[in-house]
Amino acid sequence: QAAPFPELCSYTWEAVDTKNNVLYKINICGSVDIVQCGPSSAVCMHDLKTRTYHSVGDSVLRSATRSLLEFNTTVSCDQQGTNHRVQSSIAFLCGKTLGTPEFVTATECVHYFEWRTTAACKKDIFKANKEVPCYVFDEELRKHDLNPLIKLSGAYLVDDSDPDTSLFINVCRDIDTLRDPGSQLRACPPGTAACLVRGHQAFDVGQPRDGLKLVRKDRLVLSYVREEAGKLDFCDGHSPAVTITFVCPSERREGTIPKLTAKSNCRYEIEWITEYACHRDYLESKTCSLSGEQQDVSIDLTPLAQSGGSSYISDGKEYLFYLNVCGETEIQFCNKKQAAVCQVKKSDTSQVKAAGRYHNQTLRYSDGDLTLIYFGGDECSSGFQRMSVINFECNKTAGNDGKGTPVFTGEVDCTYFFTWDTEYACVKEKEDLLCGATDGKKRYDLSALVRHAEPEQNWEAVDGSQTETEKKHFFINICHRVLQEGKARGCPEDAAVCAVDKNGSKNLGKFISSPMKEKGNIQLSYSDGDDCGHGKKIKTNITLVCKPGDLESAPVLRTSGEGGCFYEFEWHTAAACVLSKTEGENCTVFDSQAGFSFDLSPLTKKNGAYKVETKKYDFYINVCGPVSVSPCQPDSGACQVAKSDEKTWNLGLSNAKLSYYDGMIQLNYRGGTPYNNERHTPRATLITFLCDRDAGVGFPEYQEEDNSTYNFRWYTSYACPEEP
């Protein structure tokens, strides 16, 4: 029997029942490699509470339709005296990425999963040349899911201070260059997930091979390699490779674009601080609404409730299904059953079954998926209680006044599946707007001006034109709504600019579009403020002008006009200056534009070194000073010792010259032991220091790539700017 979803075959997938602390391993084409589940288990359940394993689906006992996959077992289960067998059921829905199997629910006998994936789509429109699993569970069974970062067309430009090259990447899949309007990517070879553009040429420097890996709490790694042996002439004989480290920000504030932290010998190291690297919580509710502050999610399905005897009707070939949400179906022949989903046989309308009761409901939001489960319905002949699973999809243009209607998609062993497109399933997710601008390879970053939460305060604009009696206070935040504190406490919730006077407060505009580079300055436009008459809404323009070293000065009101419909502010600030590389001495570096000074001398070991262990080697490194360890040259800043026999190499002479670019501090040691290549290139070491406020001194990590690239990454609080 051919595998039903070949794209999903190469991997063993994971799903989690968080409530019961159960981890499922799923291999839909073969068997999972877990001894305790036996040699032919396709779905292996690991109960972490009892530390037991059970096979709940056998690869040999597989049956499939276009959208459902069932794995039976030979194990009996106790369900009201029947001799039913334990089984797993996976409902497939079309998605835009390979996606992830989601645990839905489990009864005594059946373990239900749902999987939104390109593999289930009728058309190949979303299918990739190469895609790998893009999620991972941590030790606490919390899910880290990067699927939302996958670009279906185009790519992310990696931030780098080198003006001559541009590195474009996608996450977990190759770059679709055909559907991308940008001309730069057109030349990228097919299958590449990391494309290096140099002038008019584009090179494949990495393709996805393995899925996402969790290396530490809230730190994920994705590796791309170049499959074919052909070497690139600018790589000094090395095979290119790309490592992307996704870091969950220690606070909500620090999301960034991907940054290149090292690139010697075509080993590209990228760091990406993103909230998607944080664990995603599963939200559940027994009512018809749920909200989660951390996820910035608020859902209310009560407007979908039907009253006055009407229900939603969904056609299921042999049966009609009458549904209601947030209440029971009120049609005549169902109303004794307290059913939320009522199943009526078309050929004999006296045959009526409750396919789920409204007081037995679970509403779940998980990783962008909204599911409503009604269980505890009438029993089937097998002894199962009928149950219904409704998968909601956001559709802002749904019919029926935005409510939409449920559509029956299939049945597995007395579980009925529906999809429902409705505007009420549209979840308010976090903003994806950038707080910066680009001009070719020049980058501008306004995030230093953002005020996030107390004890920080809003920026207050200076307005010299007013007398004290008629004084208006203008509160401004950048790329963020104003904080409702102090005099701005009464400001409208989503205002990014707010005017407060004795009559109250006014929304002068919301953050709806990213900043733009215009005429040498940065323009930030806030629109959709309060009404200002004639059906118009207040709009505010902020012009940010580069002023190196100044992050303290406040914005100034320049004009207001159009009958109170337009406000213009000017702001002289270091945040509007182009990001550039700066060099420093004596283990310090000063970011003159942002006004930050960094001193890494506390990391220097007066005697000794930091030891970094890999399988084959010990590395001894120091910061801004020499290592003093017996095998190592006294003036080397980094040194490599073979574990097996203490062969040693000097990886570069120590110095204290730091360089700084966009939140990244680097230290380069050069002039080490020459390689045995034709050019006898001296070995060199690059240490990249990155901010982690919780790390203290931190420790160096070797970016293990090949035998001749010595990149270390070091998360430390000493690389963090002082809070303004």
């Epitope: 005697n607 000794g608 030891k611 003093s628 095998p631 203490e646 032991t673």
Partner: antibody, heavy 116, light 109 residues
Framework: EVKLMESGGGLVQPGASLRLSCAAS????????MSWVRQPPGKAPEWLAL??????????EYNASVKGRFTISRDNSQNILYLQMNTLRTEDSATYYC???????WGQGTLVTVSA | QAVVIQESALTTSPGETVTLTCRSS?????????AIWVQEKPDHLFTGLIG???NRVPGVPARFSGSLIADKAALTITGAQTEDEAIYFC?????????FGSGTKVTVL
Amino acid sequence: EVKLMESGGGLVQPGASLRLSCAASGFTFTDYYMSWVRQPPGKAPEWLALIRNKANGYTTEYNASVKGRFTISRDNSQNILYLQMNTLRTEDSATYYCVRGGFAYWGQGTLVTVSA
Amino acid sequence: QAVVIQESALTTSPGETVTLTCRSSTGAVTTSHYAIWVQEKPDHLFTGLIGGTNNRVPGVPARFSGSLIADKAALTITGAQTEDEAIYFCALWYTNQFIFGSGTKVTVL
């Protein structure tokens, strides 16, 4: 097989000089740092000097107790390690060992006796 | 000058686990001390066991392991054998020189 063979020991008078040699075989000599260690009768070993490998510039280090009197050197073409000992004292009497790297491989030792 | 301190003697039985330690008079032993362990058998036969704190010399049985335990370097013999009866020396690196300890005599009864 790694082999280290010391020679050049013997009986000398205080104030005299002596040069110890160590013939190395079974490994690429220039890849490894080498040391001299001595052990007076009934006592613990005492590290004397090291000379690093080619990759680390053949730099040297000495125990403070012998610095200025003893010199470590190597002939990489012959795979020989040397210890030049000047102004010998009675307390320099010991068995002298040639050692590869961090004391992984030791020679059988050569006895040096300094006595009037 | 720093002093390296070892237990003078330890006794164990075949099959037992024994841990020897190596302390520095100047404070905690760290990976920068590049701790090494050597074994001396009768007739001044020296064999290197551990280099660089925890790297076993090739050919040395797996029952010998090096580590750092509570600010000290440690050599653990897991499942001691009669042929392990010997004197064990540790040496630590201090910026630019090695200093040996006085040795631990291990008896396997």
